[in-house]
């Protein structure tokens, strides 16, 4: 017979999603079993029929990835998750609503922190994300958010930081005392969609003046 | 060397339509985010709509939403602005521009559009 | 929509000058802040972006400085070819949405 409460097989259905890497995980309830077997459907919001998940049916692991079926930006999508303990009870979980563009949460860039006597110089590489554009290309978080910026950080000393942000991708921090060590800190940021990321962070020394030796 | 060059502007009645064109040349054309932007007779400047080339992701200012439409060709390098239902007040010069390492520097030399009756 | 509200609409300088144009944003947008000039019957051009740093090609007369909602353009000797429009644009979010600029005229 079917429990009192699928909470006792299934709970915590939901989508964590990172640069747009979509994964479907759930845990166990307290009457869960390590035989326990999971199967993954999901459907488009506004489609009746959900779509059984290849590769994700009678699994025992608790994640799925449902990136390339949830890749198109402009939708909306549910998953459910179906429990099958070893003694045939089942339960069944439907995530909330999906929008990998609303979910999505940004893992700090990646940067390049170049040491120079007085400046140090940060380079951020464009972040790919698994979502292909028509041409096959991968589109990175720049195609996707228009009002995407690096904010970065230079912390100076304990009381004094200098900052800098911009849409482009190279920076350079002026005016530093040669032969010294900084905290730099990059994040992402997507105002529009109130999204920040962690930060990259960078410990670099600049390059000691020679020109007096 | 970047150039961009805009055409279709004319005089056009109101409720009529009006395809623009740009063609750019001297940058990826096919991995960047395109512009326009309008000038009011005397008046000052107004970003209308944006696309990326590569996501086909579009925004456009709420006093054209439904009315215009931004699109690209990416094998022709060529970006157009579709303008439908045209009213007296989108009478202007319409520029289209093209950000390049983070930064809307470079703009065509703007196609004067006039609705009138 | 952030609102960019440009001072003053128009200014009368003398050659050799120092010309300060102010820009207040609705809301505060970092440093995305740039700012143009524009000619008659000419596109704009840019000529400060990030709030402070000078695109190339721009002489330095031109300065730029200001965070979060308060900016300010400086023109420290006004020359004959600075007579023209200036606009405050911000980069922060759609719309990207200018000042109502400021005429620089000869006095």
């Known amino acids: 017979h079917a429990p009192e409460d699928p909470s006792d097989l299934l709970q915590h259905v939901k989508f964590q999603s990172s640069n747009f890497e979509n994964i479907l995980t759930w845990d166990s309830g307290p009457e869960g079993t390590p035989d326990t077997v999971y199967s993954i459907e999901y459907k488009t919001y506004g489609e009746r029929d959900w779509v059984a998940k290849k590769g994700c049916q009678r699994i025992t692991r608790k994640s799925c990835n449902l990136t390339v079926e949830t890749g198109n930006l402009t939708e909306l999508y549910y998953a459910r998750v179906t429990a099958v303990s070893a003694g045939g009870r089942s339960a069944t979980k439907m995530t909330d609503r999906f929008s990998s563009l609303q979910h999505t949460t940004l893992k700090p860039p990646d940067v390049t922190c170049i040491s120079k006597v007085r400046s140090i110089q940060m380079i951020v590489h464009p972040t790919p994300t698994p979502i292909r554009a028509g041409d096959g290309h991968r589109l990175t978080l720049e195609d996707i958010f228009h009002d995407l910026f690096y904010h970065l950080e230079l912390q100076v000393n304990r009381t004094y930081q200098m900052h800098l942000g911009g849409k482009q991708r190279e920076y350079e921090f002026f005016g530093l005392t040669p032969d010294t060590e900084f905290l730099g800190t990059i994040m992402i940021c997507v105002p529009t969609w109130a999204k920040e990321s962690a930060p990259y962070m960078c410990r670099v020394k600049t390059l000691p003046d020679r020109t007096w030796t | 060397e970047v150039q961009l060059v805009e055409s279709g502007g004319g005089l056009v009645q109101p409720g009529g339509s009006l395809r623009l064109s740009c063609a750019a040349s001297?940058?990826?054309?096919?991995?960047?985010?395109m512009y326009w932007v309008r000038q009011a007779p005397g008046k000052g400047l107004e970003f209308v709509s944006v696309i990326n080339t590569r996501s086909g992701i579009t925004h456009y200012v709420e006093s054209v939403k439904g009315r215009f439409t931004i699109s690209t060709d990416n094998a022709k390098n060529t970006l157009f602005l579709q303008m439908n239902s045209l009213k007296s007040e989108d009478t202007a010069v319409y520029y289209c521009a093209t950000r390049i390492q983070g930064l809307i520097d470079y703009w065509g030399q703007g196609t004067q559009v006039t609705v009138s009756s | 929509d952030i609102q960019m509200t440009q001072s003053p609409s128009s200014l009368s300088a003398s050659l050799g000058d120092r010309v300060t144009i102010t820009c207040q944003a609705s809301q505060s947008i970092s440093s995305l802040l740039a700012w143009y000039q524009q000619k008659p019957g000419q596109a704009p051009k840019l000529l400060i972006y990030g709030a402070s740093r000078l695109q190339t090609g721009v002489p330095s007369r031109f300065s730029g400085s200001g965070s979060g909602t308060s900016f300010t353009l400086t023109i420290s000797g006004v020359e004959a070819e600075d007579l023209a429009t200036y606009y405050c644009l911000q980069d922060y979010s759609w719309p990207l949405t200018f000042g109502q600029g400021t005429k620089v005229e000869l006095k």
């Open positions: 001297g940058f990826t054309f096919s991995s960047s985010w």
